[in-house]
Interface confidence: low
């Protein structure tokens, strides 16, 4: 595959009159990455899912959900050509549609699961554009997509690449940050114990200052709950 074909343009815009549906556009045959930001504190401990909706009021049929163990949500889970991964600290759910096809177009939802209920994080309209480098009959893309220029739309450009077979995705920033924080806490705890022993004090009288291990100010490291299936 030539490098040019690995460049994926991702157009994101808010649809007026479509109940805050965010539009993501991808090119047929390439990959499309959909991101759904959310409040990581509000949705702490919850698994996430990606479902396809039949019309605005129709049922939302589950396509793929994050790992059964919430702590392992950063691990990419596949269902066919659709992958899901959750940056639980950063508060970003990412869905990858590999080898995008005309039939992938439609209304979707990013969901946060709790019990048998599901909260909608974002409504997404996936639009599939014909590949300008593919000279097959455009009849394959029989439903119309956006083909005009997007002068009024807020456009984000995203460069993406396909994951090769066996390639291990790099962990999300938040996971690395979490590990770093745990390492720092261990060092500080050891230092505190050492200092307490040195001064003949009981451990814990001078706790280490709070660490900000979140992406935003005010996000403090919380004790992680035990491994559980929420």
């Amino acid at each position: 595959m030539e490098p040019l074909r690995l460049l994926i343009l991702l157009f994101v815009t808010e649809l007026s009159g479509a109940h805050n549906t965010t539009v993501f556009q991808g090119v047929a045959g390439q990959s499309l990455q959909v991101s759904c930001p959310y409040d990581s504190m509000k949705h702490w401990g919850r698994r996430k899912a990606w479902c396809r909706q039949l019309g605005e009021k129709g049922p939302c049929q589950r396509v793929v959900s994050t790992h059964n163990l919430w702590l392992l949500s950063f691990l990419r889970r596949w269902n066919g050509s659709t992958a899901i991964t959750d940056d639980t600290l950063g508060g970003t759910l990412t869905i990858t549609l590999r080898n995008l096809q005309p039939h992938d177009a439609g209304l979707y939802q990013c969901q946060s699961l709790h019990g048998s209920e599901a909260d909608t994080l974002r409504k997404v309209l996936v639009e599939v554009l014909a590949d300008p480098l593919d000279h097959r009959d455009a009849g394959d893309l029989w439903f119309p997509g956006e083909s005009e220029s997007f002068e009024d739309a807020h456009v984000e450009h995203s460069i993406s690449r396909s994951l090769l077979e066996g390639e291990i995705p790099f962990p999300p920033t938040s996971i690395l940050l979490l590990l770093a924080c745990i390492f720092l806490i261990k060092i500080l705890a050891a230092s505190a114990l050492w200092a307490a022993a040195w001064h003949g004090q009981k451990p814990g009288t001078h706790p280490p200052s709070e660490l900000d291990c979140g992406h935003d100010p005010g996000y403090q490291l919380q004790t992680l709950p035990g491994l559980r299936d929420t």
Epitope: A18, E56, G106, L125, W142, P144, E146
Partner: antibody, heavy 120, light 106 residues
Framework: QVQLQESGPGLVKPSQTLSLTCTVS??????????WSWIRQHPGKGLEWIGN???????VYNPSLKSRVTISVDTSKNQFSLKLSSVTAADTAVYYC????????????WGQGTMVTVSS | DIQMTQSPSSLSASVGDRVTITCQAS??????LNWYQQKPGKAPKLLIY???NLETGVPSRFSGSGSGTDFTFTISSLQPEDIATYYC????????FGGGTKVEIK
């Protein structure tokens, strides 16, 4: 509840242009989860898809009719239209407008249809 | 073009009978197939989408199955109000419809 209503002349002369309009009520034509279609049915025969239009104005047509078909949208009037040029008696049919679910081939809401006869 | 061959073209059955209609695609269309019901003088009405999913509000006696090239539409217990013509429609490429099956009551 979205409803569609076709309107236009019931009689068109051969070689002229057939023009029909579909008015959408009970919902916005600009809703991004849908596209808008024209389908026709020859007397006593099956259904034939003519083409689709999206709220943005982008279109796709049946290859067999492509050279003669133009579908347009007027979001301010909540309408979309069909023009079929150089008509012959073979274009005599009931013409339906319908709403499709984007990404699905599902036509979930239909107009009641309008009969168009091509005759001199 | 993908051709959709529907059979039979017409059938007559008694109230309560199980009615089966088949639709064959000229090439593999996965599950990209819908079924519609059209009553005389009316517009078609969606019954089944994606080969086997029942549209909201449609009675459960209607069902669909199949994948690839061969599809089946079934009315488990024919009712008088089911008198209509039934069409299959593929959407693997641009939509094409089957020729229709006219269902009558004996």
């Amino acid at each position: 509840q979205v409803q569609l209503q076709e309107s236009g002349p019931g009689l068109v002369k051969p070689s002229q242009t057939l023009s029909l309009t579909c008015t959408v009520s009970g919902g916005s034509i600009s809703s991004g989860g849908y596209y808008w279609s024209w389908i026709r049915q020859h007397p006593g025969k099956g259904l034939e898809w003519i083409g689709n239009i999206y709220y943005s104005g982008s279109t796709v047509y049946n290859p067999s009719l492509k050279s003669r078909v133009t579908i347009s949208v007027d979001t301010s009037k909540n309408q979309f239209s069909l023009k079929l040029s150089s008509v012959t008696a073979a274009d005599t049919a009931v013409y339906y407008c319908a709403r499709g679910l984007y990404g699905y081939g599902v036509l979930d809401v239909w107009g009641q249809g309008t009969m168009v006869t091509v005759s001199s | 073009d993908i051709q959709m061959t529907q059979s039979p073209s017409s059938l007559s059955a008694s109230v309560g009978d199980r009615v089966t209609i088949t639709c064959q695609a000229s090439q593999d269309i996965s599950n990209y197939l819908n079924w519609y019901q059209q009553k005389p003088g009316k517009a078609p009405k969606l019954l089944i989408y994606d080969a086997s999913n029942l549209e909201t509000g449609v009675p459960s006696r209607f069902s669909g199955s199949g994948s690839g090239t061969d599809f089946t539409f079934t009315i488990s217990s024919l009712q008088p109000e089911d008198i209509a013509t039934y069409y299959c429609q593929q959407f693997d490429t641009y939509p094409t419809f089957g020729g229709g099956t006219k269902v009558e009551i004996k």
